[in-house]
């Protein structure tokens, strides 16, 4: 018994005066607590606790279940204990089969012994299976067997407490270890869509998926810069042992413009927190914005190809797209496709492929697109660079020789006279009148130039060349004169020579 100094409160004394007592099943247990301020006896084994207010604890016929710690406490709160083993060959273990272990922590397999003198107190796998190689344990006959640093891999491990009695191995009832995982990473959060675009009155519904090792992960939807509690609904699933999924769905049944903003799905566990955001934009009506990918004024050489390309944003989805030229709709030569296959995509591309353009195909090409709310259009002015074409070459009633040429850029007309039957026209003739005409006849983009010279200046047989040229090329036409007496006569224009 402990010795104490006089005057100081001392713990009670117990008879018999030893720390451990072994009795046989059926024998009497008699324990006496001596203390002037005796309060109570307490008996503890596993989760069971009993009290006795008498200073002598008597169990007439001891059973294995009377094995445990008997503690006497006085009025000063001081106590003394004795551990009693009730040896029962038929019941070597007292068991509490509930067995939970937190990952990376120690856990106790509660199978205290009724006989401390048995040997080889340890753990064994069920049905003869070996225990995991890395499983370490410490046996304690009074408490059970402590498994050190529980691993996630031990989850659902079936095991027995085991002792050797008289050379034979005796097993306890089986235990199933349930491992509670430790949070070793932040929760994984994802959102059904990163952004939402809605019209007023439409329903906004967004789902956040939270994944973690257990259901004790916390999650909530928050609106950035707002403390308002949001209405959310939950669904959850366990996919296997350490794969928990929760879906938190936020709904606004009739969205308004002022509901626009950033919504955050927040989740945390003991390791840390994670979040993901989605952006809601609510517009009062749909829209279409068109962005030309090339200059809307296009210069292209005769015979070359050009692609007219636009990108456009359309919400709601575009319903009708068309390319128009000269009030006629293209049925082919164009394609329209979404910029991305993303479900929330509102950006589209339309391409008109113009191949081997002719000078007559310059003009305004218009892209039109509409959805249920709006229409939009963009026009491209296409100028086809063409070498001059001589439209007409006439001798007028007033004696003028008139040459009209069309091309782009604007042609220049020069005049030359070749006397007699010479092949080379070198003597230049100054025009009397040069005009750039309004292009009502030839198509858009071509510029028409009309130049005139006075044919009365020519006194000899010969050929007059009208030469039209620009940056792209040159073209000539010839007018042949022959004099018959005093009359000047035009003779067959292509009979004189080939230019």
């Amino acid at each position: 018994q402990p010795s104490v100094s006089p005057g100081e409160p001392s713990p009670p004394s117990i008879h018999p005066g030893k720390s451990d007592l072994i009795v046989r099943v059926g024998d009497e247990i008699r324990l006496l607590c001596t203390d002037p301020g005796f309060v109570k006896w307490t008996f503890e084994i596993l989760d069971e606790t009993n009290e006795n207010k008498q200073n002598e604890w008597i169990t007439e016929k001891a059973e294995a279940t009377n094995t445990g710690k008997y503690t006497c406490t006085n009025k000063h709160g001081l106590s003394n204990s004795i551990y009693v083993f009730v040896r029962d060959p038929a019941k070597l273990f007292l068991v509490d089969r509930s067995l939970y272990g937190k990952e990376d922590n120690d856990t106790l397999v509660r199978c205290p012994l009724t006989d401390p003198e048995v040997t080889n107190y340890s753990l064994k796998g069920c049905q003869g299976k070996p225990l995991p190689k890395d499983l370490r344990f410490i046996p304690d006959p009074k408490a059970g067997i402590m498994i050190k640093s529980v691993k996630r891999a031990y989850h659902r491990l079936c095991l027995h407490c085991s002792v050797d009695q008289e050379g034979k191995s005796v097993l306890s009832e089986k235990f199933i270890l349930k491992v509670r995982p430790a949070f070793k990473a932040v929760p994984v959060v994802s959102v059904s869509k990163a952004s939402y675009l809605l019209r007023e009155g439409e329903e906004f519904t967004v789902t956040c998926t939270i994944k973690d090792v257990s259901s004790s992960v916390y999650s909530t939807w928050k609106r950035e810069n707002s403390q308002t509690k949001l209405q959310e609904k939950y669904n959850s699933w366990h996919h296997g042992d350490f794969n928990y999924e929760r879906q938190a769905t936020l709904t606004i049944s009739s969205a308004r413009v002022n509901d626009s903003g950033v919504f955050m799905c927040y989740a945390n566990n003991t390791f840390g927190s994670a979040n993901v955001t989605t952006t809601l934009e609510v517009v009062d009506k749909g829209f279409i914005n068109i962005f030309p990918m090339i200059n809307t004024t296009v210069f292209v050489n005769d015979g070359e190809n050009v692609d007219l390309i636009v990108e456009y944003e359309a919400f709601p989805k575009p319903e009708h797209q068309q390319w128009i030229y000269m009030n006629r709709t293209f049925t082919d030569k164009w394609e329209d496709y979404p910029k991305s296959e993303n479900e929330s995509n509102i950006r589209y591309v339309s391409e008109l492929h113009l191949t081997r353009l002719k000078g007559t195909e310059g003009g305004t090409y218009t892209f039109l697109v509409s959805n249920s709310d709006v229409n939009a259009a963009i026009a491209f002015n296409v100028y086809v660079n063409t070498k001059p074409e001589i439209l007409t070459y006439d001798r007028l009633v007033n004696g003028m020789l008139q040459c009209v040429a069309a091309g782009f850029p604007e042609p220049t007309i020069d005049w030359y006279f070749c006397p007699g039957t010479e092949q080379r026209c070198s003597a230049s003739v100054l025009p009397v009148d040069v005009q750039t005409l309004n292009s009502s006849g030839p198509p858009f983009g071509k510029l028409v130039v009309q130049s005139s010279i006075d044919s009365s200046a020519f006194k000899h047989n010969g050929t007059v060349e009208c030469k039209a040229y620009n940056d792209v090329g040159k073209t000539s036409a010839y007018f042949n004169f022959a004099f018959k007496g005093n009359n000047k006569e035009q003779i067959h224009p292509h009979t004189l020579f080939t230019p």
């Epitope: 005769d302 015979g303 002719k358 000078g359 007559t360 063409t386 070498k387 074409e389 001589i390 439209l391 007409t392 070459y393 006439d394 001798r395 007028l396 009633v397 007033n398 009209v404 009502s440 006849g441 030839p442 073209t475 000539s476 036409a477 010839y478 007018f479 009359n487 000047k488 006569e489 035009q490 067959h492 224009p493 292509h494 080939t498 230019p499």
Partner: antibody, heavy 122, light 108 residues
């Protein structure tokens, strides 16, 4: 000598298509603009279309614009007229004709083919 | 207006002179050309420019112009001259050629 020979015309139902061709010889085909002119039964001459000497430019009468296409193949010395969405009023003898002045698109027509009859009737 | 107007029919005694006329605004500036068309045949150019004849066209055919009127004259008409005659000129406000309605010449 200059010769222009049109292909056989034929009968077509309204809304259908027909293609005429005109084979040229006796001159430098690639130097001259070529025209199509038509003449409805018992009526006068009506200019239809022209293609410039190199085929880079085409012009049409308002009555056929958007339905008829003139083209040429200088390597084959052949002129074509593709007639789509035919109407009863397109019934006529179709002549191909050569421009008189080398390199000039519009002007007098100095040689004509013998003509081919196109009948549009249901 | 881009129209050329011709008398529908003219007759002439064999060997006499006949004049066919063509009226239109474009003729104030541009010369008319004239085409002869016999039944079942293609048109043939007979006069172009101020008064020019393609090779093979007899010199009894001549052209003239005054104001908005162009004329085709046959001096000493022959039986083979019986045909339809079309005048042709540049369209005002355009470049293509337009044709008159045609004159039917009968040689008596």
């Amino acid at each position: 000598q200059v010769q222009l020979v049109e292909s056989w015309g034929g009968v077509a139902q309204p809304g259908r298509s027909l293609r005429l061709s005109c084979a040229a010889s006796g001159f430098t085909f690639s130097s001259f603009a070529m025209h199509w002119v038509r003449q409805a039964p018992g009526k006068g001459l009506e200019w239809v279309a022209v293609t410039s000497y190199d085929g880079s430019n085409e012009y049409y009468a308002d009555s056929v614009k958007g339905r008829f296409t003139i083209s040429r193949d200088n390597s084959k010395n052949t002129l074509y007229l593709q007639m789509n969405s035919l109407r009863a009023e397109d019934t006529a003898v179709y002549y191909c004709a050569k421009a008189m002045v080398r390199g000039v698109t519009f002007g007098d027509l100095d040689y004509w083919g013998q003509g081919t009859l196109v009948t549009v009737s249901s | 207006s881009s129209e050329l107007t011709q008398d529908p029919a003219v007759s002439v005694a064999l060997g006499q002179t006949v004049r066919k006329t063509c009226q239109g605004d474009s003729l104030k500036s541009y010369y008319a050309s004239w085409y002869q068309q016999k039944p079942g045949q293609a048109p043939v150019l007979v006069i172009y420019g101020e008064n020019s004849r393609p090779s093979g066209i007899p010199d009894r055919f001549s052209g003239s112009s005054s104001g908005n009127t162009a004329s085709l004259t046959i001096t000493g008409a022959q039986a083979e001259d019986e045909a339809d005659y079309y005048c042709c000129s540049r369209a005002t406000g355009g470049y293509h050629r337009i044709f008159g309605g045609g004159t039917k010449l009968t040689v008596l």
